[in-house]
């Protein structure tokens, strides 16, 4: 039961995380205009990975895409790449993990295959989460560097009384969404990896040895598992334990409504 719960929770947490990474990547508020120096601006700037926007006090908002590819800073390109890699890996991880879920039965897929798929998706989620966290952190670092650079020359004098206020940018909502989403995806991935350990068959596979007494048959199972005693119907040589380290929650007598998609 614990393994299914861990796997299911890992899947859900990762799903939320990847949705968050996608949302963060699409959001326009990666950096927002710092209002410390001009808290009463009637024009508010904010920028995303794909476009920059200006919101006026009139309510009018205008966004312009970055139509150039070569003209963009290398750091921005790197952040874009990290986020996209994170999304792609996360999406593949989700696809794999759906088939790996214990509660979903696909044909006669063995537990070892499900365990491998769970581990694969878990690793993918971990890498996806790390990509998102790295991408957001690189962007945040870029903002901090630019912030202090623009603070150093905040005002550039233009002929005495005329001054140009340089626009400074600070952390936008997308950064926090990205950090949280990346963290959730990472946690989900770790949970999937933990669940994989519970799903994987043990290395040493013991075959059950049956000892027959005159009255009844006793199947003795070495290796620390309980011996099960069969009366009546269990008189023939029967393999009761086949070596797979199964937990109780894996034994499903009847197909349930969750077995098929």
């Amino acid at each position: 039961m614990a393994v299914t719960a861990c796997q299911g929770l890992g899947f859900v947490v990762s799903l939320i995380g990847i949705a968050g990474i996608i949302a963060a990547t699409c959001m326009d508020q990666w950096s927002t205009q710092d209002l410390y120096n001009n808290p009463v601006t009637a024009v508010f700037n904010y920028q995303g990975l794909w476009r920059s926007c200006v919101r006026e006090s009139s309510g009018f908002t205008e966004c312009r895409g970055y139509f150039t590819l070569l003209g963009l800073p290398a750091m921005l390109q790197a952040v874009r790449a990290l986020m996209i890699v994170g999304i792609v890996l996360g999406a593949i991880g989700l696809l794999v993990s759906i088939f790996a879920l214990k509660c979903i039965r696909i044909g006669s897929m063995e537990d070892s295959a499900k365990a491998n798929m769970t581990l694969t998706s878990g690793i993918m989620f971990i890498v996806s989460g790390l990509c998102a966290i790295a991408g957001v952190s690189v962007f945040a670092n870029m903002l901090v560097t630019n912030f202090w650079m623009s603070t150093a020359n905040m005002y550039t004098g233009m002929g005495g009384m005329v001054q140009t206020v340089q626009t400074r940018y600070t952390f936008g909502a997308a950064l926090f969404v990205g950090w949280v989403a990346g963290g959730l995806t990472l946690i989900g991935g770790v949970m999937m990896c933990i669940a994989c350990r519970g799903l994987a068959p043990e290395e040493t596979n013991y075959k059950a040895v049956s000892y027959h007494a005159s009255g009844h048959s006793v199947a003795y199972k070495p290796g620390g598992f309980k011996a099960s005693t069969g009366f009546g119907s269990n008189t023939k040589n029967k393999k009761i334990y086949d070596g797979g380290a199964r937990t109780e929650d894996e034994v499903q007598s009847y197909p349930s409504k969750h077995d098929y998609v």
């Epitope: 009463v40 009637a42 024009v43 006026e56 009139s58 005329v162």
Partner: antibody, heavy 118, light 113 residues
């Protein structure tokens, strides 16, 4: 047709209060930022206050800060300017305006005259 | 606060003449985010409320005759009337739309000789 109709102006003594109203019609009032601008007799234009679309943000000229309050009732399509502790220098024609692209004021009411005199 | 200074205070011209009036701001009105200048021009005829002519310094409001043109960037702006008509007699104001408090220039009064 867009229309802005100011009312509530009149003669008031220094230290007194007055509430101006601006009835808007011909457009979706709740979707626009609104402002009050005044013009003293024979003088230039002076921005007084602005209220952002949702009403959550308000901005005031330093000369009226703490004395005037701009508000709006989107259900009634009405903009208000509550003026307290009025001074002689507040004597002016008060215009209600609508903000559009560029935060420019595209529509102005005909104005209401406020006279502060003893 | 951003100070808006208009020049000249008044000018008298003949009909059909070309007119230029200036507006200078104490701070740049150019928004880096969209490369637009947050300055608007208004025309106020005697006994009437002001009328918007231009926003974003050079974008003409609908219904404004094309003899009017707005130009400039940063801190220096110009309103030009290519051929003055009798109905252009008015006071012209420039306004900072960049930050609060919104400030107007003192106005330029246009008269016909």
């Amino acid at each position: 047709e867009v229309q802005l109709l100011e009312s509530g102006g009149g003669l008031v003594q220094p230290g007194g209060s007055l509430r101006l109203s601006c009835a808007a019609s011909g457009f979706t009032f709740s979707s626009y930022t609104m402002s009050w601008v005044r013009q003293a007799p024979g003088k230039g234009l002076e921005w007084v206050a602005t209220i952002i679309i949702g009403g959550s943000y308000t901005y005031y000229a330093d000369s009226v800060k703490g004395r005037f309050t701009i508000s709006r009732d989107n259900s009634k399509n009405t903009l208000y300017l509550q003026m307290n502790s009025l001074r002689a220098e507040d004597t002016a024609v008060y215009y209600c305006t609508r903000l559009v692209k560029g935060s420019a004021m595209d529509y102005w009411g005909q104005g209401t005259l406020v006279t502060v005199s003893s | 606060d951003i100070v808006m200074t208009q020049s000249p205070d008044s000018l008298a011209v003949s009909l059909g003449e070309r007119v230029t009036m200036n507006c200078k701001s104490s701070q740049s009105l150019l928004q880096s985010g969209n490369q637009k200048n947050y300055l608007s021009w208004y025309q106020q005829k005697p006994g009437q409320p002001p009328k918007l002519l231009f926003y974003w310094a050079s974008t003409r409001e609908s219904g404004v005759p094309d003899r009017f043109s707005g130009s400039g960037s940063g801190t220096d702006f110009t309103l030009t009337i290519s051929s003055v008509q009798a109905e252009d007699v008015a006071v012209y104001y420039c306004q900072n739309d960049y930050s609060y408090p919104f400030t107007f220039g003192q106005g330029t009064k246009l008269e016909i000789k």
